[in-house]
């Protein structure tokens, strides 16, 4: 299952951690996809490491763990974020976070 804070808020110009927690007794995580609405933020592969989309590369830092740290937030960053955990042999699990960026 995926456990996450469904609604988070942060100040404009600040930073926020996007985090999903996956728990399973049997399945291992092989890949994690992070998206902002339909736009790719980053992909983590156990075998290949992190790929951060170039459009976000100056503001998105991998971690902690399989989460992302989103920096220099703007009002336009308000919206839905999705984590997709690819696991073996358990299949695919998805989580949703709504981020509200507030004026500082």
């Amino acid at each position: 299952t995926i456990d996450t804070k469904r609604n988070i808020s942060a100040e404009e110009g600040g930073s926020v951690i996007l985090q999903c927690h996956f728990s399973s007794d049997t399945a291992e995580v092989t890949q994690v996809d992070w998206k902002q609405q339909d736009q790719l933020l980053a992909i983590y592969s156990v075998d290949l490491g992190w790929h951060v989309a170039s459009v976000f590369s100056d503001r998105v830092v991998p971690g902690p763990s399989l989460g992302l740290t989103f920096q220099s937030l703007t009002m336009n960053d308000t919206g839905e974020y999705f984590c997709t955990y690819h696991t073996y042999p358990g299949g695919i699990y998805k989580g949703r976070i709504f981020l509200k960026v507030q004026e500082s």
Epitope: I43, S45, D47, L48, G49, W50, G63
Partner: antibody, heavy 119, light 107 residues
Framework: EVQLVESGGGLVQPGRSLRLSCAAS????????MHWVRQAPGKGLEWVSG????????GYADSVKGRFTISRDNAKNSLYLQMNSLRAEDTALYYC????????????WGQGTMVTVSS | DIQLTQSPSSVSASVGDRVTITCRAS??????LAWYQQKPGKAPKLLIY???SLQSGVPSRFSGSGSGTDFTLTISSLQPEDFATYYC?????????FGGGTKVEIK
């Protein structure tokens, strides 16, 4: 014995294509990510591309993105590198390599296959 | 892309010397760093992975340390077979990248 054997290199004109193969033996090929690394004559190592065990995730060096395609056939214990629109700067010895599980360090390398791009 | 800067680019040393090679990453890469040894005409050989884990079969005179952006490979007592070129490689971010290499030569 764990072994990787590359083939398919040769002399090719700029703009043409070449397909490299890597035959794996002595380990369960389908359990591992695989990689291509190249080395231009007298130069250092350059990572070219990597592919996960199930082809679910793939990465490329910026210098080859859009021109090279990595693929694998687990049933044939084989890794491939399709190289299109070749340039003189692609001239190098191409190695395939296998990682230590969960470490991303490359512990088994082939002997390499030489690709020369020249008119 | 992550740039890895190795220093020195070459070092002259004698058998028995302690040799230290550094690798600096342009961004933090946690401990996802490996070290390789390469001799002329041969494929690279993995020495260290995970910044400090010694690969099976590699002599204990080789050791690695560091995390984040600064890493070190140390050869505690240089042996004749250690004269070679050494490369660091990061595997935290795609694309993976190698350092420019350090040639260890006989003084």
């Amino acid at each position: 014995e764990v072994q990787l054997v590359e083939s398919g290199g040769g002399l090719v004109q700029p703009g043409r294509s070449l397909r490299l193969s890597c035959a794996a033996s002595g380990f369960t090929f389908g359990d591992y990510a695989m990689h291509w690394v190249r080395q231009a004559p007298g130069k250092g190592l350059e990572w070219v591309s990597g592919i996960t065990w199930n082809s679910g995730s793939i990465g490329y060096a910026d210098s080859v993105k859009g021109r090279f395609t990595i693929s694998r056939d687990n049933a044939k214990n084989s890794l491939y590198l399709q190289m299109n629109s070749l340039r003189a700067e692609d001239t190098a010895l191409y190695y395939c390599a296998k990682p230590v599980p969960k470490s991303r360090g490359l512990d088994v390398w082939g002997q390499g296959t030489m690709v020369t791009v020249s008119s | 892309d992550i740039q890895l800067t190795q220093s020195p680019s070459s070092v002259s040393a004698s058998v028995g010397d302690r040799v230290t090679i550094t690798c600096r990453a342009s961004q933090g890469i946690s401990s996802w760093l490996a070290w390789y040894q390469q001799k002329p005409g041969k494929a690279p050989k993995l020495l260290i992975y995970g910044a400090s884990s010694l690969q099976s079969g590699v002599p204990s005179r080789f050791s690695g340390s560091g995390s984040g952006t600064d890493f070190t490979l140390t050869i505690s007592s240089l042996q004749p077979e250690d004269f070679a070129t050494y490369y660091c490689q990061q595997a935290f971010y795609l694309p993976w990248t190698f350092g420019g290499g350090t040639k260890v030569e006989i003084k």
